[in-house]
């Protein structure tokens, strides 16, 4: 708390500018009008205030807006956002994606903070769902965001949002998460033609059931071995040699190099030797 003292003569701030960096904490408290600060928040970030001075400015805003800052102020907080507590942020009603982006930019290059987590939570809850534009924004700043959501949270992601997901956004997902995401992706991309569909669905196939893999094998998709190795073992086991051959196309030769690894190893053990021999790869069941 800064003690209430009268502003010295001639020091009353007419605008937020560089001259304020020479003000002591008590002078900032006494001479800067909170309403002026609120309307000129965009200037604060251009001025090299100390952390202690920023504390005073935050205190003034807190007094002006005890129920929480309006979005017009929030959007221009800049580095002052780093001074906010999760409790402060829970009072906010952030609805604009531009505001979200502006605040995520402040934390860019750093790991998730409690403040940012609270902000995202408030924003997504306010929107009612994790829509495509929001997901697009969040994964741009936090590529691991999608895979940090629980299967329960992912189940509320609308299929339309799946269009925002890039292959790298799924890199850290586990099998349980892909089980939830795959049916959504299948729904989202259902109206695409064969080759385009496969390009989009490929990253999600770690959650695909056997019947979908069988269907893909009829479409000349030429799945690469890296994708095949990420498929669910229980989904691969019932596939016939002919189906795997069709699924992989020219990449079928890669099975030899992966014969000791899952799911290839387990699949080989389920096949008749006569069938494996038709591949001409020397695979031993």
């Amino acid at each position: 708390e800064v003690e209430k003292t009268a502003c010295p003569s001639g020091k009353k701030a007419r605008e937020i500018d560089e001259s304020l960096i020479f003000y002591k904490k008590w002078e900032l408290e006494a001479c800067v009008d909170a309403a002026l600060l609120a309307t000129q928040m965009d200037r604060v970030n251009a001025i090299p205030f100390t952390y202690e001075q920023l504390d005073v400015l935050k205190h003034k805003l807190d007094e002006l807006y005890p129920q929480g800052y309006p979005e017009s102020v929030i959007q221009h907080l800049g580095y002052l956002f780093l001074k906010m507590s999760p409790e402060d942020i829970r009072k906010w009603n952030v609805t604009s994606l531009e505001t979200l982006k502006a605040l995520l930019e402040v934390n860019k290059g750093h790991e998730m903070s409690p403040q940012v987590a609270t902000l995202i939570d408030r924003f997504v809850k306010g929107r009612g769902q994790l829509d495509k534009d929001t997901l697009d924004t969040l994964t741009a700043f936090y590529p691991g965001y999608l895979c940090s959501l629980s299967p329960e949270e992912l189940s509320s992601v609308p299929p339309s949002s799946i269009w925002a997901v890039r292959p790298q956004d799924l890199d850290t997902c586990d099998p349980r998460q892909l089980d939830v995401l795959y049916p959504k992706a299948r729904l989202a991309f259902q109206n695409m033609n064969g080759s385009e569909y496969f390009v989009k669905i490929q990253s999600f196939l770690g959650g695909a059931p056997t019947e979908d893999l069988k269907a893909l094998s009829q479409q000349n998709v030429s799945m690469d071995l890296a994708t095949f190795m990420k498929l669910r073992t229980d989904a691969v086991l019932p596939l016939t040699v002919a189906e795997v051959q069709k699924l992989l196309g020219p990449h079928v030769e890669g099975l030899k190099a992966e014969e000791r690894h899952r799911p290839v190893r387990d699949w080989i053990l389920r096949q008749r030797q006569d069938d494996l021999d038709t591949l001409g790869l020397g695979l031993q069941g």
Epitope: E111, S113, Y142, S148, P151, E153, Q168, T172
Partner: nanobody
Framework: QVHLVESGGGSVQAGGSLRLSCVAS????????MRWYRQAPGKEREFVSA???????SYADSVKGRFTISQDNARKTVYLQMASLKPEDTAMYYC??????????WGQGTQVTVSS
């Protein structure tokens, strides 16, 4: 940089229990996702369990109902309580931490051996 250290492994008879711990240090960020994987001799590393940013959990079918993942309040330690252990649970158990930025970190592992 993040450092993970697992402990709690050991030898146990079938039907017995063990509790694995994984302690994280360094900048893990807020609410990282913590997962346990395991690797049996001559096999690939496989997913065992996860605890996500909202504190909900998931399990591989093979351990569901027998294993329980949990985290302490400081969020820097994750546990794997393993009960009704079977010989097929024998493996090296690894802890993995994933941050919201997508950085992944693995521990060195702790050995679990279950004899019949």
């Amino acid at each position: 940089q993040v450092h993970l250290v697992e402990s709690g492994g050991g030898s146990v008879q079938a039907g017995g229990s063990l509790r694995l711990s994984c302690v994280a240090s360094g900048d893990t960020g807020y609410q990282p996702t913590m997962r346990w994987y395991r690797q049996a001799p001559g096999k690939e590393r496989e997913f065992v369990s996860a605890i996500y940013s909202d504190q909900t959990t998931s399990y591989a079918d093979s351990v569901k109902g027998r294993f329980t993942i949990s985290q302490d309040n400081a969020r820097k330690t994750v546990y794997l309580q393993m009960a009704s252990l079977k010989p097929e649970d024998t493996a090296m158990y690894y802890c993995k931490l994933t941050t919201r930025r997508g950085s992944e970190y693995w521990g060195q592992g702790t050995q679990v051996t279950v004899s019949s």
